[in-house]
């Protein structure tokens, strides 16, 4: 913490400008009043200060605002962001997609995940959901941060908006976030044809269920083996071996390559030999010829 | 040791159809897809399609699916390339090929000795 | 389809030059790319694989580099032996492709 000391007449402050790079820290502290740094907070980003002399700043907003800054100030904080933590962070209402930008455009390069994610949960919880505006602005100046939201705030967002949504911003999204994501992207999509509704949907399956993965193996999609490997293992394990040779069409050749990881080992274990040999891979591991395989879990569930 | 055996030259006349085999040895047949490739005079190589040995499901090159037919024979350990209305542009050599599984979809590790097919009237 | 773009299509070089070969895809093939070596009436002969793994035997003259959609192919020091057409071939996708071929001969 800075010491306090008493302002030098001669250091007195009374506008935000380039001489006050000049001062120790202990100046900074002593000289610089909190409101007229929050008033003039627009300046700030111009002037070249230290990453000691910001933490100065810092120190003063969070004495001048315990519970948190107000929006005028968040929308200019600039490089003054950087010395955020979540915890700061968590205490701010925003709804100005103009601070989420300048926000974003200022982490760019820095590691900054998790306050950058603490930004835009309150982003979404200070507009009230996850609209479209909010979602392109995301997307334009943050790939991948629509998966840093929780599968809460993402339940907020209405399925009209989906369609704003690109693959590449679902990269990181976890299997309950796509869980999420899944349901409201069929709805979106549900009036496309055949072709065109998977090359839309496919980003969104690593939430789909079972059924509908059946039902995309009638389809001739020819599910590429990436985007096979992220569905859900509890997805994947119901498939026949004609099933899922009829929704990887050409692509099941590459199932060997995937042999040892999951869900294709999961899924292997399942299948009868015999109809794992129909693919032609020389995949092994499947139940032996002559065995009978018992569901130990339905007489669980009886007793 | 794995070995990709072709049948020899053809010449055939245009509108014509072609038949080639590609008997494998040295190692489980039905572990691994084969592949047809060609190559025409003063032409880079082109893939064709590929076959599942152990059930004699095809898949082809778009450019080919209206005339080109792959099927397999697993008693012999032989798969067979079958191009139908045949044209000058037909003429080149034609290759099995057999994947090695390594990563992804497979690279070629094993080639046959090509089949030389000449399309003239 | 993924098509692979590869230049040049003919070159001539002195023995002991160093050689390159470009291959690009028209989209992003994950390093799943192998080159080949094709002398007349034989059948080709795989040099690389995974953009950079060489094949056991194969000289280490030879290499490869790249990512994403650009791939390059050189020999380090041209063999009169090594005069054939070389090719590359993307197996990101099961239905293969390859590239153009590039002729390489000496001057």
């Known amino acids: 913490d800075v010491e306090r000391t008493t302002c030098p007449p001669e250091k007195e402050v009374h506008e935000i400008d380039e001489s006050l790079i000049f001062y120790k820290k202990r100046e900074l502290e002593a000289c610089v009043d909190a409101a007229l740094l929050a008033a003039q907070m627009d300046r700030v980003d111009a002037i070249p200060f230290t990453y000691e002399q910001l933490d100065v700043l810092k120190h003063k907003l969070d004495e001048l605002y315990p519970q948190g800054y107000p929006e005028s100030v968040i929308r200019h904080l600039g490089h003054l962001f950087l010395k955020m933590s979540p915890e700061d962070i968590r205490k701010w209402n925003v709804t100005s997609l103009e601070t989420l930008k300048a926000l974003l455009k200022v982490s760019k390069g820095h590691e900054m995940s998790a306050q950058v994610a603490t930004l835009i949960d309150r982003v979404v919880v200070g507009r009230g959901q996850l609209d479209k505006d909010t979602v392109d602005t995301l997307t334009a100046f943050c790939p991948g941060c629509l998966c840093s939201l929780s599968p809460e705030r993402l339940s907020s967002v209405p399925p009209s908006v989906i369609g704003a949504v690109r693959p590449q911003d679902l990269d990181t999204c976890g299997p309950r976030q796509l869980d999420v994501l899944y349901p409201k992207a069929r709805l979106a999509f549900q009036n496309m044809s055949g072709s065109e509704y998977f090359v839309k949907i496919r980003p969104f399956l690593g939430g789909a269920p079972t059924e509908d993965v059946k039902a995309l193996s009638q389809q001739n999609v020819s599910m590429d083996l990436a985007t096979f490997m992220k569905l859900r293992r509890e997805a994947v394990l119901p498939l026949t071996v004609a099933e899922v040779q009829k929704l990887l069409g050409p692509h099941v050749e590459g199932l060997k390559v995937e042999e040892q990881h999951s869900p294709v080992r999961d899924w292997i274990l399942k299948q009868r030999q015999d109809d794992l040999d129909t693919l032609g891979l020389g995949l092994q591991g499947g139940i032996p010829n002559g065995y009978l395989i018992l569901d130990l879990s339905v007489r669980e569930a009886l007793s | 040791e794995v070995q990709l055996v072709q049948s020899g030259a053809e010449v055939k006349k245009p509108g014509a159809s072609v038949k080639v085999s590609c008997k494998a040895s040295?190692?489980?047949?039905?572990?691994?897809?084969m592949h047809w490739v060609r190559q025409a005079p003063g032409q880079g190589l082109e893939w064709m399609g590929n076959i599942n040995p152990s059930n004699g499901g095809p898949y082809y090159n778009e450019r080919f699916r209206s005339r080109v037919t792959m099927t397999v024979d697993k008693s012999t350990s032989t798969v067979y390339m079958e191009l139908s209305s045949l044209r000058s542009e037909d003429t080149a050599v034609y290759y099995c090929?057999?994947?090695?599984?390594?990563?992804?979809?497979?690279?070629?590790?094993?080639w046959g000795q090509g089949t030389t097919v000449t399309v003239s009237s | 389809d993924i098509q692979m773009t590869q230049s040049p299509s003919s070159l001539s070089a002195s023995v002991g030059d160093r050689v390159t070969i470009t291959c690009k895809a028209s989209q992003d093939i994950n390093k799943y790319i192998a080159w080949y070596q094709h002398k007349p009436g034989k059948a080709p002969k795989l040099l690389i694989h995974y953009t950079s793994e060489l094949q056991p035997g194969v000289p280490s003259r030879f290499s490869g580099s790249g990512s994403g959609r650009d791939y390059t192919f050189t020999i380090s020091s041209l063999q009169p032996e090594d005069i054939a057409t070389y090719y590359c071939?993307?197996?990101?996708?099961?239905?293969?492709?390859f590239g153009g071929g590039t002729k390489v001969e000496i001057k």
């Open positions: 071939l993307q197996y990101a996708n099961p239905l293969r492709t």
């Open positions: 090929a057999r994947p090695y599984y390594g990563s992804s979809y497979g690279y070629f590790d094993y």
């Open positions: 040295g190692y489980t047949f039905t572990n691994y897809w």
